[in-house]
Each structure stands twice: as C-alpha cells, then as structure tokens.
Interface confidence: low
C-alpha cells in the first residue's frame, strides 16, 4: 500500500489582526482509518487548535464537511486572528485505537500576524535649550509585527538625517517595538517649529501614523534689552523705557535698579507677540529730574524663564535746562508719586 | 511557578542611594518586560520603570533622573537604583512581572513580589 | 502623562450583591489594533496587587468568573456580578497604552 503523506502547501501564512486565516491540509489516503487534529507548536507543550472527534474550538472551523465519505482534505479556517495566534500550525493524522496512535505531521505552516504600530508617542526634552544647542527627541511605537518598519523624521516638513533607530527585539517575536532618537539643532525662529515622527508599515497601507512635538516646549529664546530716555510735557520729568525683545517663553520678571538699589519689580503682563513667536515687552519709569541733580545710573534687570539676570544700565541724562527749572528745596522719589509703578505697553 | 523577591536596606538616609534586587525564580525572564513600583505609606501606586529582557529601559519621567533599572540575566534577577533620597521616597516598593508576548503591548501585570519596605530617615 | 481617575473613593457592599467602579482616562486607550489598553488591579489588605483583568475585559488566570470588565476609549467600568467576603480591598485601574504607566487613585471596597 502507498504510504500515506500528510501535505502542508504552505510554509507561511501571513493574517491582518482581526481577519481570519485558512490553513491547508490534505492526506494522501483514506488509509489507516484515524482522526486528524491541528495543534500550534510542537513536542510536548503543542496546543491543540482542532479536533473533530471532541471539544469546543468556536473559533475554528473545518473549510469542508470532515465527516463527508472519501474526504481528504481537512483544510482549517481560524476567525478573529489575533497576534496571539502566531506560530507554526501542524496537521496530524492519527491511527484509530485506545488511545489513538499519532501516525504523522505535516511539515507544518507558519502563521504570522500582521498587528499595525500604536500610533507613535513623541517625547522631548525635560529641559529648555537655548537656539544653536542640539535637542534630542524620543519616538516610540509598539505591537507591531512583521518586523519591518520604516520611521522617518522631519522639522516643518522638511526631513532630517540625524537620528539613530531601535527595533527590539532583535530575534523573533510575537510583536516588535520601535524607539527612534532624532537631534535637532535650534535656530531662533523654532517657536512655531514642529517635529514629526512618521511610522510606516505594511499593516497601515501606504497611510502612515504620525506623532509631533513642538519645539516651543523645547526652545528658550534669551531677550535682548536696551534702556533709552525721553523727555516728558513736564520739564523736571523724564521717561526712561526698557524695551525687552524677542524672547521666549513668556515667563520674564524684570527689576529697575537706582544705582544698584532694587527700586520696582514686575512680571511681564501686556505682550507683544511677534510673527516668529516670540515676544516683546517694554517698562518704563517715570523719573523726577529734581530729585537727581548728581548723576543717576537706573538699570533694567531681566530675570527670563528661571535664568540667571541680564541687564542694561543707562545714566540719567539731566540737562541744564531742568536744572534750572528745579527750586533748591526740591527733593523726591526717583519715581515720581503720579506715575503708575511699572508701564507696559 | 514564578515567583518573585525583593531584597534590600529597610533604612535609607536622605541624599543617599537606594538599591534593591529583585530576584524571579521559577521561570525566565526572556520575553517580559520587569517593572518598579512603588506605594507610600497610605497612598496609592506608582510606576516607577520596566526593563525588558534585552536591557532596555523606560523611566517614569518624574523620577527619571534618580532612576537606574538593570538586568543581570545569570543571576535572574534585576535591580533598581535611587539617587538623592527623600523622605518623599518612604514606600513599599515592588518588582513585578509585566507580559508582552502576546504581540499587542503590555497585557498585565501578572507576577508580583510581596514588596518590601524602604524607610528614608536619618 | 496620561490621568487615570476613578469612582467611587470608597464602596460599601453588601455580599452577594453587585458591585461597579468606574475609571476614566485622560486620552482615549483605544488604539487601531481595537484592544483598550487597560488593566484592574486588586491589592487586599496587608498584600501585593494582584490582576483581575488586562486589555480592558481579559479575565486574569485564575480570576472568578464573577469580576468582568467593560468599557472602550475613556470609559471602564469593573464589575463584581454577586460580592463576596474576600472581595474586600483596594481596586485600582492602570493604563498600558504608553508610558509611564499610570494608575487610578483607588477604590476602597469594604463590606457594609
């Protein structure tokens, strides 16, 4: 008699999570009389996925009628795959007995499942930088499979070439994580700049996942201050401004100093924000000349986002007109009672 | 049956370093993720770090800085590292076993040890 | 991070009657490989947690068909079709969905 053949046509089956997978099996006689089951894996740990004669297997069914006469082929059909289902499938005819004897497998087929990334997390980071300085930004994405993946980077659209990618882990697995780190190097108009982490895969049809940071959660931009005076209406007056520039985040407390001594402080209310996302601000005193015959140095100090003070120094300028203007018992505040304590504007 | 045991000092002074082992027995520790948690004293639980059996690590970004996790796979343990530690750091502290073979992500917490108290106290 | 938060803060209950708590995430847990990344946790009292349920619904090894739970994207609920005595303890949700890991405040579920 022909030796009977238990034929596996496929080596690998490749599934989308959710979708089902038929695995093929036929034998190549009706003889020794005997049941066939499918089990996952092999050796003693082997699960049993089929087995016509008993049990509850409501995910799997047989693709013809097994208990047909002269059928031979006992192809399986396995709905809702999860990536839990990946492994090798055999089909085993056994010989008929108490108990049933195996007799033999077929060469086996590889199920893979197909699970699409999560969508990627991106992550910046703990601390501001200031433009010129390389930042780091973290990518990551998990519980995808095949293993293949392609994760690109790009800042404002354009794609960068500098990061280095993981995939773990390296040998074989259910599923597969990515974790990318891109470096980017500031430049002062990054307030409104976006970088984007692109992850394409097989299982997301040609429409891949993205995640984004901005980098205005990455970025300090430093102010710069200039300290100018003006006269006012009144003669034995005058406005001295400190205008600061172009910084970020809004977070600024600013001192006025009369020579050396702290004179006011305030926090930066009513900004100016500029088209590259950064702000302005200005403050200004309103000085009693009278009060300041010698000289007067006032000095604007600006303490930006937690970072050590900068500042500006200017030396009153009193001409001698307004000196003129001030009685000899003229004496007061370097600012003057009517003004507000700190303008904005 | 896998099982796992947390050793280490019970008393910790401020600004030192904490360590604690955590030893699996029972079982491998290839295709996990091994995971710190800690609970101060009536409070609820946090997640400190996992690391996976390839050494990689993820840090709760609020502890990140203080926080080393690492493996030694010979000895089938892994370990946690605090840096500058604070009265704020008095917990119970557990290792636990986190599954990830399924292929989708984490899918529980499935093993912990029975935690072991850490007291931050000069 | 993501927040995790659940209600109610302490369950008196009776045995042999229902029980359900709710958890709410800050960000959806549902992602497009329709598994809610979401765990419940049971610490009883003076012991480690232990795991009730993953993905959202997945019953634990070894968990009594009488714990299930439900719920998609921010929505969870934990369920104790009939209480019994051993029930007792603190009940927290977890997210898996990334990281950190964050858990709910708890639920104090005591006997009445």
């Known amino acids: 008699e022909e030796e009977l053949q238990v034929i596996q046509p496929e080596k690998s089956v490749s599934v989308t999570a959710g979708e089902s997978a038929t695995l093929n099996c036929t034998v190549t006689s009706l003889i020794p009389v005997g049941p066939i089951q499918w089990f996952r894996g092999a050796g003693p740990g082997r699960e049993l996925i089929y087995n016509l004669k008993e049990g509850h297997f409501p995910r799997v069914t047989t693709v013809l009628d097994p208990t047909k006469r002269n059928n031979m082929d006992f192809s399986i059909h396995i709905s809702n795959i999860t990536p839990a289902d990946a492994g090798t499938y055999y089909c085993v005819k056994f010989r008929k007995g108490s108990p049933d004897v195996e007799l033999k497998s077929g060469a086996g087929t590889e199920l893979s499942v197909r699970a699409k990334p999560s969508a990627p997390v991106v992550s910046g980071p703990t601390a501001r930088a200031t433009p010129e300085h390389t930042v780091s930004f973290t990518c990551e994405s998990h519980g995808f499979s095949p293993r293949d993946i392609t994760l690109k980077w790009f800042k404002n659209g354009n794609e960068l070439s500098d990061f280095q990618t993981n995939v773990d882990p390296a040998g074989k697995s259910v599923s597969y994580s990515i974790r990318s780190t891109a470096r980017v190097v500031l430049t002062r108009r990054d307030v409104h700049s976006q970088v984007i982490c692109e992850v394409a895969h097989v299982t997301l049809q040609g429409d891949p996942l993205r995640g984004t940071a901005n980098l205005s959660e990455a970025i300090r931009v430093p102010p710069t201050l200039e300290v100018f005076q003006r006269p006012m209406r009144a003669e034995n007056q005058v406005n001295v401004t400190c205008q600061v520039r172009k910084f970020y985040p809004q977070r600024l407390l600013l001192t006025w100093l009369e020579n050396g001594n702290v004179s006011q402080t305030e926090t930066a209310s009513t900004l100016t924000e500029n088209k590259d996302g950064t702000y302005n601000w200005r403050s200004w005193l309103l000085v009693n000349t009278c009060a300041h015959r010698d000289g007067v140095v006032l000095t604007c100090q600006v303490e930006h986002d937690g970072q050590p003070a900068v500042s500006k120094s200017h030396a009153l300028e009193v001409s001698a007109h307004q000196k003129e203007q001030c009685s000899d018992t003229t004496s007061g505040p370097v600012l003057a009672p009517t003004a507000p304590l700190g303008g904005s504007g | 049956q896998v099982q796992l045991q947390e050793s280490g000092p019970g008393l910790v002074r401020p600004s030192e370093t904490l360590s604690l082992t955590c030893t699996v027995s029972g079982g491998s520790i290839r295709n996990y993720y091994w995971s710190w948690i800690r609970q101060p004293p009536g409070k609820g639980l946090e997640w400190m770090g996992f690391i996976y059996d390839n050494g990689r690590t993820f840090y709760n970004p609020s502890l990140k800085s203080r926080v080393t996790i690492s493996l030694d796979m010979s000895m089938n343990q892994f370990s946690l590292k605090m840096t500058s530690v604070t009265a704020a750091d008095t917990a119970v502290y557990y290792c636990a076993r986190v599954r990830a073979y399924s292929g989708i992500g984490l899918d529980g917490t499935d093993v912990w040890g029975q935690g072991t108290t850490v007291t931050v106290s000069s | 991070d993501i927040v995790m938060t659940q209600s109610p803060l302490s369950l008196p209950v009776t045995p042999g009657e229902p029980a359900s708590i709710s958890c709410k995430s800050s960000q959806s847990l549902l992602y497009s490989n329709a598994y809610n990344y979401l765990d419940w946790y049971l610490q009883r009292p003076g012991q480690s947690p232990q795991l009730l349920i993953y993905l959202g619904s997945n019953r634990a090894s070894g968990v009594p068909d009488r714990f299930s739970g439900s719920g998609s994207g921010t929505d969870f609920t934990l369920k104790i079709s009939r209480v019994e005595a051993e029930d007792v303890g603190v009940y927290y949700c977890?997210?898996?969905?990334?990281?950190?890991?964050?858990f709910g405040g708890g639920t104090k579920v005591e006997i009445k």
């Open positions: 977890m997210q898996a969905l990334q990281t950190p890991l964050t």
